[in-house]
């Protein structure tokens, strides 16, 4: 079953970076994605988050899995360069975590690097991961263009890893140079689309909040997702089924610092892509251990 952590999520407001720790098992769908691009000299390395949808599939943001070596075209990283860690809580202790390599990396064909429209991607794992209290899928939303309603509260978790000067082993086993060793989370309200759009249009630049995005955060700032949390799931508790549903993926924000006043985080609106996700996964709804909330 999807979207049912073995621990119930407490309704505390915490900051991802510098905030209090999440308890192990609170976000059993949370994946750490490590990309080591060794295709050209020198190697490149970065991190992101994702969400487990089934034993074999991870949902994330396309920009996490795109090689920045190309700016004119969208080139996905090679599957050989992707490692996914599940059941990870403290990056200094990988003993309870499951790591998997990628069998496929699928970027949305319309992903636009200029405005991050269609910022969604999937990773198919080489081997199905065993599910348990710390590794469980999140639910996909229903197909609905409106997305989450304004002012609804959602949760986002992340380690906020952004320092590249570390080996994968250092990241996973010691974590000494990460922004947060232990998974953090924050509770954020969905912002009305018009308000967010206006907020970005008032800034000079090519910032476009499309219908495939929604925003979350506080006008006064102070709580936000940030670099290194990219691709992580913005989850909302579905009232009817009492399951956690991935409504958003950490996509972009700015131009000011994370957590600045009236700078909302922008998330990919997952509900616009449910059909695309199922199509890539090759399973009709309900056949995978995850699923869509009914």
């Amino acid at each position: 079953e999807c979207g049912q952590p073995s621990r119930s999520l407490p309704s505390l407001v915490k900051r991802i970076i510098g905030g209090r720790n999440a308890e192990p098992g609170l976000f059993p769908w949370q994946a750490l994605i490590v990309v080591e691009d060794t295709s050209r000299v020198p190697n490149d390395k970065w991190f992101g988050s994702g969400a487990l949808l089934s034993e074999s599939w991870i949902l994330t943001a396309a920009h996490v899995l795109r090689s920045q070596r190309r700016d004119t075209t969208v080139i996905p990283v090679s599957k050989e360069h992707v490692t996914v860690y599940l059941g990870l809580h403290d990056v200094r202790d990988k003993s309870g975590a499951v790591n998997s390599s990628a069998a496929r990396v699928v970027l949305h064909p319309d992903f636009n690097i200029q405005n991050y429209n269609h910022d969604i991607a999937l990773v198919q794992l080489q081997e199905p991961v065993p599910l348990g209290p710390h590794v469980m899928p999140v639910c996909l939303p229903r197909l609905e263009p409106e997305g989450p309603s304004p002012h609804m509260l959602g949760l986002v978790a992340g380690w906020g890893i952004s320092n590249p000067n570390v080996t994968v082993d250092e990241i996973i086993s010691s974590g000494t140079r990460t922004l947060s060793d232990v998974l953090q989370y924050v509770k954020l309200p969905v912002v009305p689309h018009a308000e967010c759009k206006t907020s970005y249009e008032s800034r000079s630049g090519n910032y476009s909040v499309t219908e495939n995005m929604f925003c979350a955060g506080y006008y006064e700032g102070g709580k936000d997702t940030c670099l290194g949390d990219s691709g992580g799931a913005f989850v909302i508790l579905d009232d009817l089924s009492q399951r956690w549903v991935v409504q958003g993926l950490v996509s972009w924000g700015g131009p000011e610092e994370c957590g600045s006043k009236q700078v909302y985080g922008v998330y990919t609106k997952v509900s616009n892509y449910v059909d695309w996700v199922w199509e890539q996964m090759g399973s009709p709804q309900g056949r995978a251990p995850g699923g869509t909330v009914s």
Partner: antibody
Framework: QIQLVQSGPELKKPGETVKISCKAS????????MSWVRQAPGKGLKWMGW????????TYADDFKGRFAFSLETSARTPYLQINNLKNEDTATYFC?????????WGQGTSVTVSS | DVLMTQTPLTLSVTIGQPASISCKSS???????????LNWLLQRPGQSPKRLIY???KLDSGVPDRFTGSGSGTDFTLKISRVEAEDLGVYYC?????????FGGGTKLEIK
């Protein structure tokens, strides 16, 4: 509008260090790498390398390994080029350009003069 | 490193007349992803460079359609159908296929 605004001209002595900034605005900063290009007086353009603004990993062309360092202050949307142990032959205008390979927008250039 | 050779070194053209610049690379610029990362830029006197063309033939926004780029493999050409006064400056080709990226030596376009 997309802008790259570089720091002002520098006059340095041999052996000193210079750090040039390139403030980016008007686009999703971590979406594009940032290249650095050198232009010696009356000469053509030479690509020095680039920095991945998402990962922070720099890539240097062979001629610019050692004394040259690219860095980032992501929250300020600002890449930096630092040149250590300056030599007379480092006298040039240094440009930042958006993109690891695209180089579609350029800063106004920073003139560095090295003279004893 | 890939050597980029531009000809001519200087081009003296009357306003309203066509102009053509050649750029040859020492190896094919066709990348494994099927794209050819050959670009052109213009550096007007005393200004920073401005990209005109990318991926051989795609015009950047705001670039007049009197500019066209063509070619494949190792041979590329930038053509201006009717030169205008604002076109003067130094034109550079550069390749982004093989690391490190390399520029041509430049072609100075003068107005007769």
């Amino acid at each position: 509008q997309i802008q790259l605004v570089q720091s002002g001209p520098e006059l340095k002595k041999p052996g000193e260090t210079v750090k040039i900034s390139c403030k980016a605005s008007g686009y999703i900063f971590t979406s594009y790498g940032m290249s650095w290009v050198r232009q010696a007086p009356g000469k053509g353009l030479k690509w020095m390398g680039w920095i991945n603004t998402y990962s922070g990993v720099p890539t240097y062309a062979d001629d610019f390994k050692g004394r040259f360092a690219f860095s980032l202050e992501t929250s300020a949307r600002t890449p930096y080029l630092q040149i250590n142990n300056l030599k007379n032959e480092d006298t040039a205008t240094y440009f930042c350009a958006r993109g690891g390979e695209a180089m579609d927008y350029w800063g106004q250039g920073t003139s560095v003069t090295v003279s004893s | 490193d890939v050597l980029m050779t531009q000809t001519p070194l200087t081009l003296s053209v009357t306003i309203g007349q066509p102009a053509s610049i050649s750029c040859k690379s020492s190896q094919s610029l066709l990348d494994s992803d099927g794209k050819t990362y050959l670009n052109w830029l213009l550096q007007r006197p005393g200004q920073s460079p401005k990209r005109l063309i990318y991926l051989v033939s795609k015009l950047d926004s705001g670039v007049p359609d009197r500019f066209t780029g063509s070619g494949s493999g190792t041979d590329f050409t930038l053509k201006i159908s009717r030169v205008e006064a604002e076109d003067l400056g130094v034109y550079y080709c550069w390749q982004g296929t093989h690391f490190p990226w390399t520029f041509g030596g430049g072609t100075k376009l003068e107005i007769k």
